[in-house]
Amino acid sequence: LPKAPVITTPLETVDALVEEVATFMCAVESYPQPEISWTRNKILIKLFDTRYSIRENGQLLTILSVEDSDDGIYCCTANNGVGGAVESCGALQVKMKPKITRPPINVKIIEGLKAVLPCTTMGNPKPSVSWIKGDSPLRENSRIAVLESGSLRIHNVQKEDAGQYRCVAKNSLGTAYSKVVKLEVEVFARILRAPESHNVTFGSFVTLHCTATGIPVPTITWIENGNAVSSGSIQESVKDRVIDSRLQLFITKPGLYTCIATNKHGEKFSTAKAAATISIAEWSKPQKDNKGYCAQYRGEVCNAVLAKDALVFLNTSYADPEEAQELLVHTAWNELKVVSPVCRPAAEALLCNHIFQECSPGVVPTPIPICREYCLAVKELFCAKEWLVMEEKTHRGLYRSEMHLLSVPECSKLPSMHWDPTACARLPHLDYNKENLKTFPPMTSSKPSVDIPNLPSSSSSSFSVSPTYSMT
């Protein structure tokens, strides 16, 4: 008698390893013999697909070599025209030993930056990833973390992070190890001990001592007044990534000696500089403070403006303060080529004394800003017209670079000599007699925003502030 199909062995979940065989059995009782079709994720499996073998009148489906992409829901459907079609479904779970698909690579990184060592894995169950540094498991902390992807992220890389690393991927089926990679931490050249300035008698022997560190170990060169040291003996030693250089000098003239530590990072170099002065008798000694240091002005642009042998402040927020500050002045001076002969010398004096601020001794030598009164004299008397143009250009964003903005002081942010005559520097170039000022052309604006102070006569050493000038 005809009999509708009944699936006597329902499909079950099958676990299979990659590259192994997986078989689903769909035993059917019926009369006449049914037609059995198979689907994966509701898509019909074609009889001629060579990745599959369908036997026993369609009751056995074999995946000949399981791939990672084969997982899904497999269903068999039996139909013999008697009654309705019947269906049974089961899942194929592809199990996979851990496999590292993107292993870590050797990394060179500069101290303080972020390092990421990749370790992307495959596997089912999903492998857990851990890392080994040297021979020990790597502990995570606030800086070091294993990301969800398995990659190792190290924030603010430190010297002690250098070493050999490998990642380990583990699941219930096995463990995979990456090859060992090297994390090399490079450190910018840094001066540990700067040479000290000396005030000595003529003919003395002085040893300047400079110690630097970095990875790779830096080289040290000595510069005397801007040129390679021509005399004196240099002794060097290297121990534990620290280079120690001693320059012995026979002193017959004062000089500025700079120790330059240099090391290479790929195609780039990092340098650190420290300077000391050798002075004879009353020559001044520049000392370092935490924002920069004092040194004799050795540039060209401000030669005519700054006093001979002026000690100026070099700002160490620039990698090369002398060069950077000189470039600032140079850029600003180019803008001055078009200003009036009345404005130009005053503006040049202002720029040079603002960018290369006079050094003032004290607890530590520090830069001394220009007095507000002199700044205002330039802004509202000597260069009133030009200043208005510059402010307009700045407002409209017409300058090619913004470097000149650093060159022009904001007068209101400068100290007044009225409250502390030692808080700021005068501009000797503006110490004209009041008689001379009467010959200056009238201002463009009807009245300056503040009254211009009386500038001292050249014979006077003190600065008399006009009674009306009381801007605080």
């Epitope: 009353e282 006093a307 042998d309 002026a310 006079e358 004290g362 409250w419 030692t422 808080a423 605080t472």
Partner: antibody, heavy 115, light 112 residues
């Protein structure tokens, strides 16, 4: 006219702490170096500390580690925190405006350290 | 630290007399770059706060009478009161500002 008004002085036991304040007016406080100077009874002047326009502080060796100078440019106020006070810290404490010279002085606030 | 030594420790003068007070520093207080002497003079009248008289060794602070003048260089400095007045009775201090500030021990001026 520059005015510097100190406050916060008083009697304190050895090992104790005190916080001195100096309210400044009549000038743009943030643009100037500010100092603390003290004068023990019947004695001379002793400079203690200076704070520059970037709030970088410097101290005399005698108070380094015990005293802390600070400034609040919004409130136009200079502070001196005195910790671990000793009897020899008994003095009149002056707030002073000035960089190379001590140009303007307050009237002072008396600190007495005694058990 | 630079040590400042003042002399004499006290002086008595009559009104109209000239008075000189000396101050010696243990090392030079002249800054080579600008050749300024970082030496200041102060007056402290009884019961009052000190006031600045002279800075940079010889520059008179504004509002200070012309009878007060300063001179000297390197390590030796002098404060001169050309014609002493009754209101000049005070203690006078020198102070160096070349490094961490230090004061002299003071000179007491009494008027006869």
């Amino acid at each position: 006219e520059v005015q510097l008004v100190e406050s916060g002085g008083g009697l304190v036991q050895p090992g104790g702490s005190l916080s001195l304040s100096c309210v400044a007016s009549g000038f743009t406080f943030s643009l100037y170096y500010m100092n603390w100077v003290r004068q023990a009874p019947g004695k001379g002047l002793e400079w203690l500390s200076v704070i520059d326009t970037h709030s970088i502080a410097y101290y005399a060796d005698s108070v380094k580690g015990r005293f802390t100078i600070s400034r609040d440019n919004v409130k136009n106020t200079l502070y001196l925190q005195l910790n671990n006070l000793k009897p020899e810290d008994t003095a009149l404490y002056y707030c002073v405006l000035g960089r190379t010279a001590l140009v303007r002085w307050g009237q002072g606030t008396q600190v007495t350290v005694s058990s | 630290d630079i040590v400042m030594t003042q002399s004499p420790s006290s002086v008595t003068a009559s009104v109209g007399e000239k008075v000189t007070i000396n101050c010696k520093s243990s090392q030079s207080v002249v800054f080579g770059s600008n050749q300024k002497s970082y030496l200041n003079w102060y007056q402290q009248r009884p019961g009052q706060s000190p006031r600045l008289l002279i800075y940079y060794a010889s520059t008179q602070e504004s509002g200070i009478p012309d009878r007060f003048s300063g001179s000297g260089s390197t390590t030796d400095f002098t404060l001169t009161i050309s014609s002493v007045q009754p209101e000049d009775a005070a203690v006078y201090y020198c102070q160096q500002a070349y490094s961490a500030p230090t004061f002299g021990s003071g000179t007491r001026l009494e008027i006869k």
